[in-house]
Amino acid sequence: GITNINCSGHIWVEPATIFKMGMNISIYCQAAIKNCQPRKLHFYKNGIKERFQITRINKTTARLWYKNFLEPHASMYCTAECPKHFQETLICGKDISSGYPPDIPDEVTCVIYEYSGNMTCTWNAGKLTYIDTKYVVHVKSLETEEEQQYLTSSYINISTDSLQGGKKYLVWVQAANALGMEESKQLQIHLDDIVIPSAAVISRAETINATVPKTIIYWDSQTTIEKVSCEMRYKATTNQTWNVKEFDTNFTYVQQSEFYLEPNIKYVFQVRCQETGKRYWQPWSSPFFHKTPETVPQVTSKAFQHDTWNSGLTVASISTGHLTSDNRGD
């Protein structure tokens, strides 16, 4: 970077090299060039020569003043115009940064995704700081009083094998950067209460021709948790409002849920589950699309497990008696 150049003098920033965004700052340049009484001192920001607010302080030093500096990062360097030198002479350079002190981390959440082998802790970091901000996650056993600390730039995955101090812990997060430090409230957790079941996935849908046509949604999870509560939400793709159905589920077999839907309408379905009575839910599953038939034929929509939900294409094949389409929309 700019800080690695050989200097013939000195460049410095007041109040500091890293400062609060929106501050007025002064950049000083002091030349120490052999056989040169600088006629002029020039400042450059990101390679562009600065024109305004440059004040000469004395024979060797000049000041560049910025009002309300808002750039997160800038490379500054300064040069001297020496008599009898055709080109400007480089004095020195410095990278400067502006940003904000961290907000108090809040909404600290720790969950164990089933089969992951990790406790994942996340938090709301607050407003963007623009500068390097580190987070220390403190995990303290309420049984042994032993405390462990984990340094990270965002969230943290802590191996459940390293949580040897029993089941109950206090978790809190400290945020720190060059402009300040803040600490979250403490979160009390019990490892058995924060497990989120293995993801529930909708595999297919079919509409059965009957007096009143009926749509069956097939869905499943690999969870070994016995008592699981789930929600399935659905709506016509043209609607804003979701309908929600609740289920107490036993995943020893594939779930089948029945819906009576309007004909010839494209619907979207999503499912999520939690261990019954616990705090945390899975995130909603990927959207699963199914269009109900106009009238008679049986329609099946399949989620191909190897496909990720991405495209906007409909794959359709017509065979005797029913229409099959995948879940990827139009």
Epitope: Q37, P38, R39, K40, I48, K49, E50, R51, F52, I54, T55, R56, K59, E81, P83
Partner: antibody, heavy 119, light 107 residues
Amino acid sequence: QVQLVESGGGVVQPGRSLRLSCAASGFDFNSYGMSWVRQAPGKGLDLVADINSKSYNYATYYADSVKDRFTISRDNSKNTLYLQMNSLRAEDTAVYYCAVHHSDYFEYWGQGTLVTVSS
Amino acid sequence: DIQMTQSPSSLSASVGDRVTITCRASQDIYTNLAWYQQKPGKAPKLLIYHASSLQEGVPSRFSGSGSGTDYTLTISSLQPEDFATYYCLQDSEYPPTFGQGTKVEIK
């Protein structure tokens, strides 16, 4: 050799607009700052507006007396400098010179164009 | 902005005279000073830059000196074509500023 030719001056009523041009040749236009310096009848020289070279990212400067009324611009493809003068006042009456600066002193000057603001 | 004060505002001299015009800056301008000559109805012409460097094509009877805040333009032997108005310009700090001018007239 360096040549600067101003045009666009004339008699104009107060409140009206005028656009001056300065056609430049004989030097690398991009690498030089360009200025408008005016001289009221019988008075001294005053920097009115300045548009800097590429190395300064073409930063512009205006004297307080013309801020928000005058606009300096340059067309590097045509080697031409402009001064758009709006809301003209009697005190804007002057000879307007186009000048070139590589350092910050004015090395070359045009012959000037007279602007008379009168009702 | 830096203020430039020129003196005298006018002077009368004869051909062959040694003429000195001074320019004082409101702060140290570190030899960033230029001198211009302007004849009636003509554009200014650069004579001297960096306080003492003679612009190409300018007769050697013109010279400049000075440092800090005080600067001098000297015409060693005044010629008929030198009767004109002379201006100093500081370009140490932006924006550059002119002195108010010194008119050199025939005595």
